[in-house]
Every structure is written in C-alpha cells, then in structure tokens.
C-alpha cells in the first residue's frame, strides 16, 4: 500500500486558557528527510489553512513568527499546540503530513481531531 | 476572482525550447503546491512536473526528466515550466494546476498549446 | 508507480438514466487519495470528488463517489444533458501522481 496513514486524536478539551494540544503521528512509507506539517480547519465543507512548518527530521519543528502554533518532533510524531482559541474557533483540526524529500513524495491526511473551546466566565466583580 | 492564466505556448521544431508561464490570481500563491499536467490531442491527462511551496523541492515524470525544469517566483505569484530538446511526442495542451489543501487539483488554468513539429 | 484503469473506454446511456464508472488501482490508494474530474471539449478538467466520496464545491449532489483499496466508482444517478463528457480518476497520494485513461459518456 502507497498510502501514508496519519493518526490524531478524535477529540480533545482546550484549556481555559484557549490552548489545545494534541499529537499527530504518521506511519512514513519511506526515509523522509525533509517533512511538512500542516494544520487544516473544516467547517461545514471549507477547509483553511491554520498553520504550517516544514522541518528536516532530527531537527526542531519551527512555525513562523506569528502563528498560533508551534510544535515539536520525535520521530515520526509530532506535537502540536494552537493557542489563543476561542469558543468560535471550535471545530474539526487536521493534520496533514507531506513527506517532500528525497523521493517519493507522500501525502497523508488524518480524520481530525474535533476541539472544543469554552470561553472563560468572567470574573464576578469584587466589593474589595 | 480566483484564476490561473498559462501562457507562452506555440509551435516550436524537434530540439527547440519553450517556457510557459502560468500566472496566478486571488489566493496566497505561496501557500499551495502547483503541478504542470499535460493532454496530448485526442488523449488523457499526464502529469508532468510537481513543486513545493518555496520552490526547492521539485518531481518530474519520467518522459520529460532532464529536459523540462519548472520553477515558482511566490513574489510575482507565477509559475513556469521551461521545456528544452523539445520532441513531437511533447505536443500537447499544457495546464498549470493548483494542489487543494486535500490534495486534489482543485484549481486549473485554462490551458496553452504547444506544438512541436518541423 | 499506481496504474489507474477505468472502464468501460465509452459509455453510452440516455439522459435521466444512472451511470456507474470504475476505476481500478494496480495497488492500494488510500480513500483519502482518490480524486474524479469531469473535462468537457475545448474545456480544462474539472474537480467533482475528492478522497474517493466528498464532493468538491459546487457539485451537485447527483455524482456520488465511493470504494476504498484498489476499487473506486464515481456514480451520476440521473444523467443531465451537461454531463456527457469524460471522467478521470486520479491518486494524489504518493508521486508520480498518475490518471486513468478517462471514460466517455456519451448520449445513447
């Protein structure tokens, strides 16, 4: 089988706080050296990119500057943290995995693991 | 409006060069990885070249590697397939095509012709 | 490399009839990997399924995917006059990315 199978948890609970973490891990066909990691949104049947990083393995997974995201790797196993999530930003989050180099190229795809986000009740006011 | 525009297609004789330009339109060139696909007249597709989001990872098919070279300039949101020793079994209709965040070629441009005859 | 072969080469079925379409891998493609497109004469593919069952934008509902491991069909429950044409089926999970030899429906 050419497929390349990546798998992530179902579900996971952000924290208060608005981060949600979670592991992707893929079952590499080959001797990727150069990897891409990708965080994709779906809702409804639109799907958006949230963050990437493309690392070469045995290094550090790095995101750019501003993402919400950052990362890091073991292997053929990545985890993954997206912070400043709110209740709006509930949904389904999937890891897609490319193994860019050296030859072939592989895609895989995980089922998504949908992230529950609750916002904060605010603070009651204090008579102190 | 979301597009892909190829151009610089034409006639061409067995052993010339030709470089095909493939411009893109209202999404973020850079986050997508782009294909060349091709369509001999009266026949099916065939893809011809992959590359990555910055350009540095590059596939071809094996019946046009070592003679065609695609590249990405992300500044000028552009892509380009330049064909050298061009045969008449290159001719063909030749599409730029955008990879889906899914993998799928969701985005196509319209197509440019390429005919390679003495 | 992943051979696709379609069949049949030609179909021929009168409007408002079903149409099946097979498309067999020479090994296992990943559901998540196989993709239809539709190309009409003079006119660039057009994407209809992706990951073997989920219809890409604007499709309507009367195409329908299904399959997984080396056997896919792309189903046209009630042909409409546009949709004569000719359907590929591609793998996009592993290079070379590679189509079938593409199937005609044509009006009966």
């Known amino acids: 089988c050419k497929a390349m199978h990546v798998a992530q948890p179902a579900v996971v609970l952000a924290s208060s706080r608005g981060i949600a973490s979670f592991v992707c891990e893929y079952a590499s066909p080959g001797k990727a050296t150069e990897v891409r990691v990708t965080v994709l949104r779906q809702a409804d049947s639109q799907v958006t990119e949230v963050c990437a990083a493309t690392y070469m393995m045995g290094n550090e997974l790095t995101f750019l500057d501003d993402s919400i995201c950052t990362g890091t790797s073991s292997g053929n196993q990545v985890n993954l943290t997206i912070q400043g999530l709110r209740a709006m930003d509930t949904g389904l989050y999937i890891c897609k995995v490319e193994l860019m180099y050296p030859p072939p190229y592989y895609l895989g795809i995980g089922n998504g693991t949908q992230i529950y986000v609750i916002d904060p009740e605010p603070c009651p006011d204090s008579d102190f | 409006e979301v597009q892909l525009v190829e151009s610089g297609g034409g006639l061409v004789k067995p052993g010339g060069s030709l470089r095909l330009s493939c411009a893109a339109s209202g999404f973020t060139f850079s986050s997508y990885t782009m294909h060349w696909v091709r369509q001999a007249p009266g026949k099916g597709l065939e893809w011809v070249s992959f590359i990555s989001y910055d350009g540095n990872t590059k596939y071809y098919a094996d019946s046009v590697k070592g003679r065609f070279t695609i590249s990405r300039d992300n500044a000028k949101n552009s892509l380009y397939l330049q064909m050298n020793s061009l045969r008449a079994e290159d001719t063909a209709v030749y599409y730029c095509?955008?990879?889906?965040?899914?993998?799928?070629?969701?985005?196509w441009g319209q197509g440019t012709m390429v005919t390679v005859s003495s | 490399e992943i051979v696709l072969t379609q069949s049949p080469g030609t179909l021929s079925v009168s409007p408002g009839e079903r149409a099946t379409l097979s498309c067999r891998a020479s090994q296992s493609v990943g559901s998540s990997y196989l993709a239809w497109y539709q190309q009409k004469p003079g006119q660039a593919p057009r994407l209809l399924i992706y990951g073997a069952f989920s219809r890409a934008t604007g499709i309507p509902d009367r195409f329908s995917g299904s399959g997984s491991g080396t056997d896919f069909t792309l189903t046209i429950s009630r042909l409409e006059p546009e949709d004569f044409a000719v359907y590929y089926c591609?793998?996009?999970?592993?290079?070379?990315?590679?189509f079938g030899q593409g199937t005609k429906v044509e009006i009966k």
């Open positions: 591609q793998q996009y999970g592993s290079s070379p990315w590679t």
């Open positions: 095509a955008r990879t889906s965040l899914l993998g799928p070629f969701d985005l």
